[in-house]
């Protein structure tokens, strides 16, 4: 069985992640995790200095 691509992305999308489609890539820890463990990043108010939110890259098959 030939292994298909992990992800299908737009031309300007980030490079493919090592995650299977069942998981998301956590940019903060640079690891694949369950997508529910990530939080969608929200825009920060101007001047806010809170730590950067966890973000994810996730393939759409």
């Amino acid at each position: 069985m030939r292994r298909g691509p992990r992800s299908l992305r737009g031309r300007d999308a980030p490079a493919p992640t090592p995650c299977v489609p069942a998981e998301c890539f956590d940019l903060l820890v640079r690891a694949c995790v369950a997508c529910g463990l990530l939080r969608t990043p929200r825009p920060k108010p101007a001047g806010a200095s809170s730590p950067a939110p966890r973000t994810a890259l996730q393939p759409q098959e």
């Epitope: 299977v20 369950a34 997508c35």
Partner: antibody, heavy 118, light 113 residues
Framework: EVKLVESGGGLVQPGGSLRLSCAIS????????MSWVRQPPGKALEWLGF??????????EYNPSVKGRFTISRDNSQSIFYLQMNTLRAEDSATYYC?????????WGQGTTVTVSA | DIVMSQSPSSLAVSVGEKVTMSCKSS????????????LAWYQQKPGQSPKLLIY???TRESGVPDRFTGSGSGTDFTLTISSVKAEDLAVYYC?????????FGGGTKLEIK
């Protein structure tokens, strides 16, 4: 064709240990996550955990219900994936399945039965 | 842990009838960044291992007949069999893979009248 064949089940006494095997064929072993799921007789399925692929350093995730007693590992040279079960209890009696993880639990083996009884 | 609740626990239908079964999760399975619901449906025929039917709540696995349709989002999901065949006799399980531990529903047993 993807093929998963479990073995190693049987009768074991409470407190004992058992190692289940899942022989893999039909795909590149190092390139897929592999999971274990169990099903007590007449009951629903319970996910036990999985081991990620080579690209992810073969890291593992476990169900807290078995973490510390069960260990998932793999021998890629022989295309075998293992479930080491320690300190077994009566409630661990079940059919144990291995499954390939990709979009969800994509392909399943036929299962091997474990009975924990004195 | 996310609790998955399926209903009904069993149902009996005649060949050719339409069947719907429900799966509810204790929290949303929708990941807003990609609009995917991390829910799968499996079919387990008597004496066999489970088989993946649907992933991402509504995407049919390759080779699965188009009479099987998954729908829903967030916490409420449905599996529909448009015209039941005798070979559809099985237990159907939903499963979330939104977070660890992955959890399954208790199953819906489909019997043929």
């Amino acid at each position: 064709e993807v093929k998963l064949v479990e073995s190693g089940g049987g009768l074991v006494q409470p407190g004992g240990s058992l190692r289940l095997s899942c022989a893999i064929s039909g795909f590149t072993v190092t390139a897929y996550y592999m999971s274990w799921v169990r099903q007590p007789p007449g009951k629903a399925l319970e996910w036990l955990g999985f081991i990620r692929d080579k690209a992810n350093g073969y890291t593992t995730e476990y169900n807290p219900s078995v973490k510390g007693r069960f260990t998932i590992s793999r021998d890629n040279s022989q295309s075998i994936f293992y479930l080491q079960m320690n300190t077994l209890r009566a409630e661990d009696s079940a059919t144990y399945y291995c499954a390939q993880v990709r979009r969800a639990l994509d392909y399943w083996g036929q299962g091997t039965t474990v009975t924990v009884s004195a | 842990d996310i609790v998955m609740s399926q209903s009904p626990s069993s149902l009996a239908v005649s060949v050719g009838e339409k069947v719907t079964m429900s799966c509810k999760s204790s929290q949303s399975l929708l990941y807003s960044s990609n609009q995917n619901n991390y829910l799968a449906w499996y079919q387990q025929k008597p004496g066999q291992s489970p088989k993946l039917l649907i992933y991402w709540a509504s995407t049919r696995e390759s080779g699965v007949p188009d009479r099987f349709t998954g729908s829903g989002s967030g916490t409420d999901f449905t599996l529909t069999i448009s015209s039941v065949k005798a070979e559809d006799l099985a237990v159907y399980y939903c499963q979330q893979y939104y977070t660890y531990p992955y959890t399954f529903g208790g199953g819906t047993k489909l019997e043929i009248k």
